[in-house]
């Protein structure tokens, strides 16, 4: 039995005609099975295969090799969260967080909790103490005074 064009199988009861449109992107093998074109997958070959490494959770694509990020995610593979706008010395595990690095505080991680270590403001052998975000106090040796023991 010879099947008509695009019909396959015993009894010619399988249909496959190559297509490359909204409904699918496939060719047909000798048994009438759909064989997806490069970059496509799924039962109807209408799901794009995203860029290798594209986060399955935070990235997606409608065209092969693409990787479009969900809101709040960034990077080539959509695997990097976007921190809170204005976050200075902080990172995120989830979008819009601002988790402060060591010795930084405040909502935007812009307050120095180790002013003494960062700026070493005390002169002339003064001893520096961190007293709060962006705050410090110098204990001056005998014979020196002023906020930074500069006098």
């Amino acid at each position: 039995v010879t099947c008509d064009d695009y019909y396959y199988g015993f009894g010619c009861n399988k249909f496959c005609r190559p297509r490359d449109d909204f409904f699918g992107h496939y060719a047909c093998d000798q048994n009438g099975n759909k064989t997806c074109m490069e970059g496509w997958m799924g039962p109807e070959c209408n799901r794009a295969i995203c860029r290798q490494g594209c986060s399955p959770k935070h990235g997606s694509c409608k065209l092969p090799g693409d990787c479009r990020c969900q809101y709040g995610w960034q990077g080539l593979y959509c695997d990097k969260c976007i921190p809170h706008p204005g976050c200075v010395h902080g990172i995120c595990n989830e979008p819009w967080q601002c988790l402060c690095e060591t010795n930084w505080g405040g909502q935007l991680c812009d307050k120095d909790l180790n002013y003494c270590g960062t700026h070493q403001p005390c002169l002339n052998g003064g001893t520096c103490s961190n007293t709060g975000p962006d705050k410090y106090q110098c204990s001056c040796p005998e014979g020196y005074s002023g906020p930074n023991c500069e006098i």
């Epitope: 695009y6 909204f22 799924g42 109807e44 799901r47 409608k62």
Partner: antibody, heavy 116, light 107 residues
């Protein structure tokens, strides 16, 4: 087994909107497109549009462009069809259907009546 | 849009008769054609897809043929349960239009 279960009958006033749901079970929801078809009383079948359930992309018949919106909620395996600016001629049974090579599975239909 | 012309629009026949319904399209749709049967108050039922493939569970007295622009649904020996309305539909490109229907009645 494959099932498409639609929401109940609706009575709407002209100018209003209606949103019909189609809850799917028995297969992977995002593997198959959902189509919407309507049938006015005593009339034939009219194809309204298709939605790709994986991406949420939809294509509509020209006649309904601008008035119809098809959406999906993959978390509940439900497709929705919303028709706005209703008029009396929109009185019909609205069906959802699954398929690529024709519609092997249909919802039971939702009667939408538009009357003042 | 592809136009679907289905004929006849109505048909009277008797149990045991051989019945043919035709569907003509305004352009080549290859074999992207489907036939449905619908009974009052029910959703349509798929009979034949891709012009000539019988859907699962459909009796062998139903058959489809044709390709390109001319298609036929044949019922070789009408049974009482076959009296219904029949529709063709193409699924080649958007929109997937239906034919106007053929109402098959008992003579």
């Amino acid at each position: 087994q494959v099932q498409l279960v639609q929401s109940g009958a609706e009575l709407k006033k002209p100018g209003a909107s209606v949103k019909v749901s189609c809850k799917v079970s028995g297969y992977a929801f995002t593997d198959y497109a959902i189509h919407w078809v309507r049938q006015a009383p005593g009339q034939g079948l009219e194809w309204m549009g298709i939605i790709n359930t994986y991406y949420g992309d939809s294509k509509y018949a020209q006649k309904f462009q601008g008035r119809v919106t098809m959406t999906v909620d993959t978390s509940t395996s439900t497709a929705y069809m919303e028709l706005s600016s209703l008029r009396s001629e929109d009185t019909a049974v609205y069906y959802c259907a699954r398929g690529y090579d024709g519609f092997a599975y249909w919802g039971q239909g939702t009667l939408v009546t538009v009357s003042s | 849009d592809i136009q679907m012309t289905q004929s006849p629009s109505s048909l009277s026949a008797s149990v045991g008769d051989r019945v043919t319904i035709t569907c003509r399209t305004s352009e080549n749709i290859y074999s992207y054609l489907t036939w449905y049967q619908q009974k009052p108050g029910k959703a349509p039922k798929l009979l034949v897809y891709n012009a000539k493939i019988l859907a699962a569970g459909v009796p062998s007295r139903f058959s489809g043929s044709g390709s390109g622009t001319d298609f036929t649904l044949t019922i070789s020996s009408l049974q009482p349960e076959d009296f219904a309305t029949y529709y063709c539909q193409h699924h080649y490109d958007i929109p997937w239009t239906f034919g106007g229907g053929t109402k098959l009645e008992i003579k």
